[in-house]
Amino acid sequence: EEELQMIQPEKLLLVTVGKTATLHCTVTSLLPVGPVLWFRGVGPGRELIYNQKEGHFPRVTTVSDLTKRNNMDFSIRISSITPADVGTYYCVKFRKGSPDDVEFKSGPGTEMALGAKPSAPVVLGPAARTTPEHTVSFTCESHGFSPRDITLKWFKNGNELSDFQTNVDPTGQSVAYSIRSTARVVLDPWDVRSQVICEVAHVTLQGDPLRGTANLSEAIRVPPTLEVTQQPMRVGNQVNVTCQVRKFYPQSLQLTWSENGNVCQRETASTLTENKDGTYNWTSWFLVNISDQRDDVVLTCQVKHDGQLAVSKRLALEVTVHQKDQSSDATP
């Protein structure tokens, strides 16, 4: 008969809290007669995990049927893993004896370490909105993972970004680790519909990375362009003037009409038209009364967008003599 060898193939076993861990042990001989036991740790303080011979171990099951004579597999499964289960596990063969069985040979041990999954990455954008062509920073954080090795990538609309810095803490030994990464993203005018994605890959995720996203719509402000135009047709003694507010984001917009410097109408944007790129358009109409006394009317369309400084566009109203006559004719 060959000399008994206790084989524990894994030096390190990563397990996740709540899952089941399988600890492998095979023997090369059935001799000597006696049980196989599993311990955590070594020396007099070692903890009995499983005894083939006796005892009640509710969390432990054997992988193979130990009642079969030719069985040489003494692997066990431990269910509902908790952080308290970490340590080095030894498969030990005993020789039948009295008053106690005699330890005959031990396996080399398998270290069980907590392979904690990282939390879902949380991506935070800048506190304030920024206009296109500027650079904004996004942070991505994930916590509670182990071991320390982890991979983090950034994407913008599926394209991998390269301008980012990542830190994993703590630098020394720990039960769990955290990762924080900051990416710098240059905003484009069309980024209202864009997304940044933070992707975290870890050994506990079995090749299925976790992703956190942030919409650039939360970070971007596209300022409007204004165009004020006088409509050729008039209604009675009134001329219609429009202020077209184009390509702005977000929706928040207040518009003020002034006539020769005097405020005469305030509006809050509603019933907006959405563009393909996610920006909005809005048109405001203003009716100006025409009379003989009014030769030089200057209209101003002033827009305050998303709490920023107001922008305005002026229009000097063109009132022809013919229009004045028409207007006079129409006056009762």
Epitope: V36, K53, T67, K68, K96, S98, D101
Partner: antibody
Framework: EVQLVESGGGLVQPGGSLRLSCAAS????????MHWVRQATGKGLEWVSA???????YYTGSVKGRFTISRENAKNSLYLQMNSLRAGDTAVYYC????????????WGQGTMVTVSS | DIQMTQSPSSLSASVGDRVTITCRAS??????LAWFQQKPGKAPKSLIY???SLHSGVPSKFSGSGSGTDFTLTISSLQPEDFATYYC?????????FGQGTKLEIK
């Protein structure tokens, strides 16, 4: 089905010899420690001999030097060669299988009667 | 050799009774103790090994306990088929030895 069937018992004169056989079915005999146990009429059980998986042999004091335990793997059989038989060897002889890891007896044969008498 | 002593040698009981048989070893045998049941004219049947583990197919009314030198076999509720002779056996070291037996009879 796991089974042990003994044969070879009978009447023999003191000083004579007898060879008991035990045919195993349903398992590989060589993978187990195997035993012979005897029981005199109206008496208790007495362990007689054992053979380990490595071929190591063991005997109770009263039969040492007279009895020989062996096995034939090809026939999946166990044997007990009994020489210099005495009246005190008269008993039913049982073939017994030892347990998987601790050698606890689990399977018993039906027994074969050996009578040593003149 | 390790001596095994059973008590009582015989025991009368009624159907439904709970009975306990004890077995004492002359030295520490760890828990390498087995119990067997034998009916007249039949081969012994293995009931318990390592003092408290039931062989497959053995009803749970049989239970064993003990370690070291003192052991017990308990039958929780006697049925007619349980009246037989019971033997304990140490198998920690050769020569394996049996107790003298306890004959359980119907009262």
């Amino acid at each position: 089905e796991v089974q042990l069937v003994e044969s070879g018992g009978g009447l023999v004169q003191p000083g004579g010899s007898l060879r008991l056989s035990c045919a195993a079915s349903g398992f590989t005999l060589s993978s187990y420690d195997m035993h012979w146990v005897r029981q005199a009429t109206g008496k208790g059980l007495e362990w007689v001999s054992a053979i380990g998986t490595a071929g190591d042999t063991y005997y109770t004091g009263s039969v040492k030097g007279r009895f020989t335990i062996s096995r034939e793997n090809a026939k999946n059989s166990l044997y007990l060669q009994m020489n210099s038989l005495r009246a005190g060897d008269t008993a039913v002889y049982y073939c017994v299988r030892g347990g998987v890891w601790d050698d606890a007896f689990d399977i018993w044969g039906q027994g074969t009667m050996v009578t040593v008498s003149s | 050799d390790i001596q095994m002593t059973q008590s009582p040698s015989s025991l009368s009981a009624s159907v439904g009774d709970r009975v306990t048989i004890t077995c004492r070893a002359s030295q520490d045998i760890n828990n390498y103790l087995a119990w067997f049941q034998q009916k007249p004219g039949k081969a012994p049947k293995s009931l318990i090994y390592t003092a408290s583990s039931l062989h497959s197919g053995v009803p749970s009314k049989f239970s064993g306990s003990g370690s070291g030198t003192d052991f017990t076999l308990t039958i929780s509720s006697l049925q007619p088929e349980d009246f037989a002779t019971y033997y304990c056996q140490q198998y920690v070291s050769y020569p394996y030895t049996f107790g003298q037996g306890t004959k359980l009879e119907i009262k």
